[in-house]
């Protein structure tokens, strides 16, 4: 299935991305809890992953979607808005064989999926079910519908400093 816009560009058949089965540690943090680099705009907090001026946090603990949203908010971030193929592929590179909540929810009254910034998602969400109003990534190469009340890991996202 196409994840973003319908096309024949072969987006879902990429060269070599897939589940990352092993977790590798990040650089050693500095004492203030930030991984500092020499380049402007590349500072992410300890245990966050940097890519293209954004910081991403992949939790190891699990919680419901609402709790995940509040967790990210408490860290000055939001659940990840995975609105480009590039961002999705990066996250697929750094997620292991687990499901992670992202900032995508189904609006029943509109019958459409929206990102938490309110932008519409026109792509494909697999595993749709009457009771599945939230979405995860990580176990498959697609966005999967999931129950908002079941506990999964979460991906938070914010601007690098």
């Amino acid at each position: 299935p196409q994840i973003f816009n319908k096309s024949n560009d072969g987006f879902t058949t990429t060269r070599s991305y897939g589940t990352v089965s092993q977790i590798f540690g990040s650089s050693s943090p500095s004492p203030n809890g930030f991984i500092t680099t020499r380049s402007y705009g590349t500072v992410c907090p300890k245990d966050w992953e940097f890519y293209q001026a954004r910081c991403f946090f992949l939790s190891t603990s699990e919680s419901s979607w609402n709790e995940s949203r509040d967790f990210c908010k408490g860290k000055g971030s939001t659940l990840a808005i995975v609105n480009t193929p590039e961002k999705l592929k990066f996250l697929q590179d750094i997620t292991d064989a687990e499901k992670y909540f992202i900032g995508l929810i189904y609006h029943r009254e509109e019958k459409r999926w929206r990102w938490i910034n309110n932008s519409v998602f026109n792509g494909n969400v697999t595993n749709q079910n009457q009771n599945f109003n939230c979405a995860t990534i990580g176990l498959t190469k697609t966005f999967d519908a999931a129950s908002c009340d079941i506990s999964y890991r979460r991906i938070c996202e914010k601007n690098a400093k």
Partner: antibody, heavy 118, light 112 residues
Framework: QVQLLQSGAELVKPGASVKISCKAS????????IHWVKQKPEQGLEWIGY????????KYNEKFKDKATLTADKSSSIAYMQLNSLTSEDSAVYFC???????????WGQGTTLTVSS | DIVMSQSPSSLAVSAGETVTMSCKSS????????????LAWYQQKPGQSPKLLIY???TRESGVPDRFTGSGSGTDFTLTISSVRAEDLAVYYC????????FGGGTKLEIK
């Protein structure tokens, strides 16, 4: 097949502005960012910035943020770069290219030669 | 910004020889969790647009001869061309795609 077709060579006077186009075909335009690269004669490549037509995200090399303005027309799959307050330093070949995380989409336009001269 | 430095700026070799060129970045381009270095090599022949040779520091682009080999990790990278041919006359650029995008200054390969 994926193609990026750029507009033709431009000869403009100092102080003027110019708008270069890049017509994309062979893939879904909104799925991949369009980048712009400058190459002065006999010199290296400089990244100017990119526009992501899907979500409207635009980022510039700090050096070009007051020089270049990037736009895109989703309906026609055309990306544009406007260069303003032109000087002889802006004389160069300008390339558009698309880019994808895993380099499946790494195609370049043929280049547009800009000459700034009175 | 990340600064990319290439050396040498030019070199001349005879056909059949092996050549190596260096690219250094001002900060690490490795994401250890993704196991990827966000570094690519491009070849630009005279009068042409650049062409992708190597991505993720060491993965050869489809259709690129195996004479071209990328290596290195973190901040130090190398492009090696074995059994150089006349058609390899070009400028070779490295580019980082980890924090926005930056090209190195290029290495011009000339054939004696």
């Amino acid at each position: 097949q994926v193609q990026l077709l750029q507009s033709g060579a431009e000869l403009v006077k100092p102080g003027a502005s110019v708008k270069i186009s890049c017509k994309a075909s062979g893939y879904t335009f909104t799925d991949h960012a369009i980048h712009w690269v400058k190459q002065k004669p006999e010199q290296g490549l400089e990244w100017i910035g990119y526009i992501s037509p899907g979500d409207g995200d635009i980022k510039y090399n700090e050096k070009f943020k007051d020089k270049a303005t990037l736009t895109a027309d989703k309906s026609s799959s055309i990306a544009y770069m406007q260069l303003n307050s032109l000087t002889s330093e802006d004389s160069a070949v300008y390339f558009c290219k698309n880019f994808d995380y895993d380099f499946i989409f790494d195609f370049w336009g043929q280049g547009t030669t800009l000459t700034v001269s009175s | 910004d990340i600064v990319m430095s290439q050396s040498p700026s030019s070199l001349a070799v005879s056909a059949g020889e092996t050549v190596t060129m260096s690219c250094k970045s001002s900060q690490s381009l490795l994401n250890s969790r993704a196991r990827k270095n966000y570094l690519a090599w491009y070849q630009q022949k005279p009068g042409q647009s650049p062409k992708l040779l190597i991505y993720w520091a060491s993965t050869r682009e489809s259709g690129v001869p195996d004479r071209f080999t990328g290596s290195g990790s973190g901040t130090d990278f190398t492009l090696t061309i074995s059994s150089v041919r006349a058609e390899d006359l070009a400028v070779y650029y490295c580019k980082q795609s980890y924090n926005l995008y930056t090209f190195g200054g290029g290495t011009k390969l000339e054939i004696k």
